[in-house]
């Protein structure tokens, strides 16, 4: 069974050293081999995937995952109840919404069941690991002859998100971008009616409710301009 795990682009860096350099290799036992790092992402606070690189193991190993929350009512050790697999080897754990407590320190322990001393424990701040779904329902309103307003929706508490709007015309080689706070609207004050514009938006769980570094996927683009303006000069909805 192969499970595809949604993770944003650019979140991995495989340049880290193999870090048993302080011990001679001939003295390594199984229990001193490092376990892979666990990386967790909370998707729209609906579920969380904690994954690891199972192929880094010297031989195929079904590593097990336990978790708990530090200093809380949820500090009882829990076993993973929904493993993710890569080529029939455990490579992650999925936690459901009821198991996610954003503002408590999440402790995750990876263990080799054949060598119980071989374990690694990590601590994570889940509020910094939230990735919202991409913005939806983009709409454009013509506020005046030369001014456009872009609106969108998020399937999350709007005040928790910041946004990045990108737009360009068919004449542009690159995107122009503008940061937008939790208000999820953007105005373009000067529009050239002879050009066709494309807009897209992405969102991030930052800075009011968390300090996430990762953005959502980009929304579907929406277009406005020369070849659409004759249809309805006041409202243009999503064009995929």
């Amino acid at each position: 069974l192969n499970t595809t795990i949604l993770t944003p682009n650019g979140n991995e860096d495989t340049t880290a050293d193999f870090f048993l350099t302080t011990m001679p290799t001939d003295s390594l036992s199984v229990s001193t081999l490092p376990l892979p790092e666990v990386q967790c992402f909370v998707f729209n606070v609906e579920y969380m995937n904690c994954t690891w690189n199972s192929s880094s193991e010297p031989q195929p190993t079904n590593l097990t995952l336990h978790y708990w929350y530090k200093n809380s009512d949820n500090d009882k050790v829990q076993k993973c109840s929904h493993y993710l697999f890569s080529e029939e080897i455990t490579s992650g754990c999925q936690l459901q919404k009821k198991e996610i407590h954003l503002y408590q320190t999440f402790v995750v322990q990876l263990q080799d069941p054949r060598e119980p001393r071989r374990q690694a424990t990590q601590m994570l701040k889940l509020q910094n690991l939230v990735i919202p779904w991409a913005p939806e329902n983009l709409t454009l309103h013509k506020l005046s002859e030369s001014q456009l307003e872009l609106n969108w929706n998020n399937r999350f508490l709007n005040h928790c998100l910041e946004h990045l709007v990108q737009y360009r015309t068919d004449w542009d080689h690159s995107w122009t971008e503008q940061s937008v706070d939790y208000r999820h609207k953007f105005s373009l004050p000067s529009v050239d009616g002879q050009k066709r514009y494309t807009f897209r938006v992405r969102s991030r769980f930052n800075p009011l409710c968390g300090s996430a570094q990762h953005w959502s996927e980009w929304s579907h683009p929406i277009h406005w301009g020369s070849n659409t303006s004759k249809e309805n000069p006041f409202l243009f909805a999503l064009e995929a």
Epitope: D13, A16, F19, T32, L35, E37, V107, A120, L124, N128
Partner: nanobody
């Protein structure tokens, strides 16, 4: 290869303060998870404070609110400010480092750290 050297330990009265320093050489602190651990006589080594290179810091329950971890990447040094010290804080304090791929990785398990300092003794008298 990373070399770690701790300093700042000593004898202090209960309620007093100390600031431990850990100087790293051999490479920069970038992409290193760092930790402070301690070992009291006859006890296992335990984590005190750990930090991911992305900036998240975590403390053991017993020191939360009294100890503060900080990192100075420019000086390749990390620090542990220890206030309101108690006799039960008496131990050898160790600095540790682990290269990690992810900015969020902060290990509280001592066996996850590849590099260790020689330790500095902290004694708190009542």
């Amino acid at each position: 290869q990373v070399q770690l050297v701790e300093s700042g330990g000593g004898l202090v009265q209960a309620g007093g303060s100390l600031r431990l320093s850990c100087a790293a050489s051999g490479r920069t602190l970038s992409r290193l998870a760092m930790g402070w651990f301690r070992q009291a006589p006859g006890k296992e080594r335990e984590f005190v404070a750990v930090n991911s290179w992305g900036g998240d810091t975590f403390y053991a329950d017993s020191v939360e609110g009294r100890f503060t971890y900080s990192r100075d990447n420019a000086k390749s040094a990390v620090y542990l400010q220890m206030n309101s010290l108690q006799p039960e804080d008496t131990a050898v304090y160790y600095c540790a480092a682990a290269p990690t791929s992810f900015a969020t990785t902060a290990y509280s398990s001592s066996n996850s750290y590849a590099y260790w300092g020689q330790g500095t003794q902290v004694t708190v008298s009542s």
